[in-house]
Interface confidence: medium
C-alpha cells in the first residue's frame, strides 16, 4: 500500500490518497486486478489446450483456484469457463497446470461429462468436461 | 501506464514490468480494479437506501453503468444486485445517483416488480424492484 505521503514525494504534488487505498497489479492492460492477482475472461470458445495456449501467449496461465478468501470474486462468475485443473489418469489426482494438487474443500467437483479437464462455475464448482470441447476460459496472472 | 524504466528509477532496483502492463487504481483495499474503476460486491442483503448509505460510507456510490466496453466485466456477474439507478416518477426517466440520465441501449430494463429502484443482472440487464426489498449490492468508485 502506498501512502499519500509516499505518492506526494513521488510526484511532488498534492495527491490525497487515503492510507486504506492501494494500487493493484501490475497486470496486463485491461485485465481485472483483485488482491494483486490479474484475471481475464475470454469470450471466444476454445478447447482446453487452445485455451491454455492462449493464456500462455499472454504470459499467464489458466485460472488456478487456491483460496476462497483471496479469490472470492469468483463466487459471482456466471456460466462455465475452462480453468487450469486437469485429471491425471496415472495417479487419479486432480492437479493444476503448475503441478500442484487440488486442495481439499476448495472446489466441488461435479461430473458433467466424461473427461480429464475442468470448467469453473460460480460458487467454487468444477465441472468435469472432455478437454476437446470448446468453452470460454479464464486466464490468470499472479503478481509478484 | 508506468514503464519499467520509471519503476526502476522509483525503487532503484530491477523491476522488469513490460510496458503493456500497468497498475490499476487506487482503490479501497481488497476491491476489484478494472479499467481504473473500483468495484466491490457486498454479500449482505440491504434495501436500496441502506445499500446506498453503505457505499457512501466507503466514499463510493452504487454501481453506475456508463459503458458496455469499459465495464464488460459486468456481463459475467451472476445474480441480482442493487445498482444506483432509480426511477423519477415526476418525469418518468431512469437516472443515476449523480443525476445523469440512463443512456439508451446501455441496459435492458425488465419489470420484475412494481418499483422505482433497479437491480443489476448479468449481460447488462436492469430489473425493476421495490426499493424496500433487501438485496445484495455493488459499490463503485471511479478513480481520478
Amino acid at each position: 500500500i502506498w501512502s499519500a505521503v509516499f505518492l506526494n514525494s513521488l510526484f511532488n504534488q498534492e495527491v490525497q490518497i487515503p492510507l486504506t487505498e492501494s494500487y493493484c497489479g501490475p497486470c496486463p492492460k485491461n485485465w481485472i486486478c483483485y488482491k494483486n492477482n490479474c484475471y481475464q475472461f475470454f469470450d471466444e470458445s476454445k478447447n482446453w489446450y487452445e485455451s491454455q495456449a492462449s493464456c500462455m501467449s499472454q504470459n499467464a496461465s489458466l485460472l488456478k483456484v487456491y483460496s476462497k478468501e483471496d479469490q472470492d470474486l469468483l463466487k459471482l462468475v456466471k456460466s462455465y469457463h475452462w480453468m487450469g485443473l486437469v485429471h491425471i489418469p496415472t495417479n487419479g489426482s486432480w492437479q493444476w497446470e503448475d503441478g500442484s494438487i487440488l486442495s481439499p474443500n476448495l472446489l466441488t467437483i461435479i461430473e458433467m461429462q466424461k473427461g480429464d479437464c475442468a470448467l469453473y462455475a460460480s460458487s467454487f464448482k468444477g465441472y468435469i468436461e472432455n478437454c476437446s470441447t470448446p468453452n470460454t476460459y479464464i486466464c490468470m496472472q499472479r503478481t509478484v | 501506464i508506468w514503464s519499467a524504466v520509471f519503476l526502476n528509477s522509483l525503487f532503484n532496483q530491477e523491476v522488469q514490468i513490460p510496458l503493456t502492463e500497468s497498475y490499476c487504481g487506487p482503490c479501497p483495499k481488497n476491491w476489484i480494479c478494472y479499467k481504473n474503476n473500483c468495484y466491490q460486491f457486498f454479500d449482505e442483503s440491504k434495501n436500496w437506501y441502506e445499500s446506498q448509505a453503505s457505499c457512501m460510507s466507503q466514499n463510493a456510490s452504487l454501481l453506475k453503468v456508463y459503458s458496455k466496453e469499459d465495464q464488460d466485466l459486468l456481463k459475467l456477474v451472476k445474480s441480482y444486485h442493487w445498482m444506483g439507478l432509480v426511477h423519477i416518477p415526476t418525469n418518468g426517466s431512469w437516472q443515476w445517483e449523480d443525476g445523469s440520465i440512463l443512456s439508451p441501449n446501455l441496459l435492458t430494463i425488465i419489470e420484475m416488480q412494481k418499483g422505482d429502484c433497479a437491480l443489476y443482472a448479468s449481460s447488462f440487464k436492469g430489473y425493476i424492484e421495490n426499493c424496500s426489498t433487501p438485496n445484495t449490492y455493488i459499490c463503485m468508485q471511479r478513480t481520478v
Epitope: Y49, Q52, S57, V86, G99, C117, C131, S132 | Q16
Partner: antibody, heavy 123, light 107 residues
C-alpha cells in the same frame, strides 16, 4: 514411430517468400492435443522459436516474426507449412519442424525433430 | 519476453570430469525449463524436462535441478560422446525462448 521431414527450396531471393513444408509420418497429425512447431538456427548461432500450430489451425507466433510469418496445417496431407515473407540475409538458417512433448497437459520441451533443412537467402 | 542466460558460453573439459552448466531466467518460470544437447549438423535432442526429469533413453550421468529463475545441468562424468552444445529453453510462456548455448569442448 513419429517422423518429420522438411522440404522446400534451399535458396530464396531477398524480399521473396520462404516456403517450407513438414510431412508427418508414423503417426497422426491431428488430435485434441496435437501441436506442431517451427524452430530455426542461423549458422553458428542459437535456436529461435518461430511459432506453433494446433491441429485445429490455431497459431502462436514469435512476435519478432509475427507480421511476416504464416504457419498452416493440412491434416488431409499430414503436413504443416511455414511461410516467411520479405526475407533478408538474416533469415538464412537451418529450419526445423518439430513436435512438442505434451504430457499431463503441459509442454515439456520438443522431443521429435525433423533433420532440418538449410535455407540460404541470397540473390 | 523471458530471457535465458547460460553460463559459461564455452567450457573446456576432459573425459571423466564433472561438468555443470547454469541457465538463469529473467523472470520466474517455475519448473518449465528444458535442456537439449546438439551435435554439429544434427537436430537438438531433448535431455531433461521439466527442470529435473530425465527423458527416457538419456544416460543417468545427466541430471538437472533448479526452479524459479536458476537452473543447472550437470554431467557427473563426461564421456567422449558428450562433447556438444547444450541449450536451455523456457516453456512457461510464449514466445518460447532458448539460451544462447554452452559449448562443451575437449580440453
Amino acid at each position: 514411430q513419429l517422423q518429420l521431414q522438411e522440404s522446400g527450396p534451399g535458396l530464396v531471393k531477398p524480399s521473396e517468400t520462404l516456403s517450407l513444408t513438414c510431412t508427418v509420418s508414423g503417426g497422426s497429425i491431428s488430435g485434441s492435443s496435437y501441436y506442431w512447431v517451427w524452430i530455426r538456427q542461423p549458422p553458428g548461432k542459437g535456436l529461435e522459436w518461430i511459432g506453433n500450430i494446433y491441429s485445429s489451425g490455431s497459431t502462436y507466433y514469435n512476435p519478432s516474426f509475427k507480421s511476416r510469418v504464416i504457419i498452416s496445417v493440412d491434416t488431409s496431407k499430414s503436413q504443416f507449412s511455414l511461410k516467411l515473407n520479405s526475407v533478408t540475409a538474416a533469415d538464412t538458417a537451418v529450419y526445423y519442424c518439430a513436435k512438442p512433448l505434451l504430457r499431463d497437459y503441459y509442454f515439456y520441451g520438443v522431443d521429435v525433430w525433423g533433420q532440418g533443412t538449410t535455407v540460404t537467402v541470397s540473390s | 519476453d523471458i530471457q535465458l542466460t547460460p553460463s559459461p558460453s564455452f567450457l573446456s573439459a576432459s573425459v571423466g570430469d564433472r561438468v555443470t552448466i547454469t541457465c538463469r531466467a529473467s523472470q520466474a518460470i517455475s519448473s518449465y525449463l528444458a535442456w537439449y544437447q546438439q551435435k554439429p549438423g544434427k537436430a537438438p535432442k531433448l535431455l531433461i524436462s521439466p527442470a529435473s526429469t530425465l527423458q527416457s533413453g538419456v544416460p543417468s550421468r545427466f541430471s538437472g535441478s533448479g526452479s524459479g529463475t536458476e537452473f543447472t545441468l550437470t554431467i557427473s562424468s563426461l564421456q567422449p560422446e558428450d562433447f556438444a552444445t547444450y541449450y536451455c529453453q523456457q516453456l512457461k510462456s510464449y514466445p518460447w525462448t532458448f539460451g544462447q548455448g554452452t559449448k562443451v569442448e575437449i580440453k
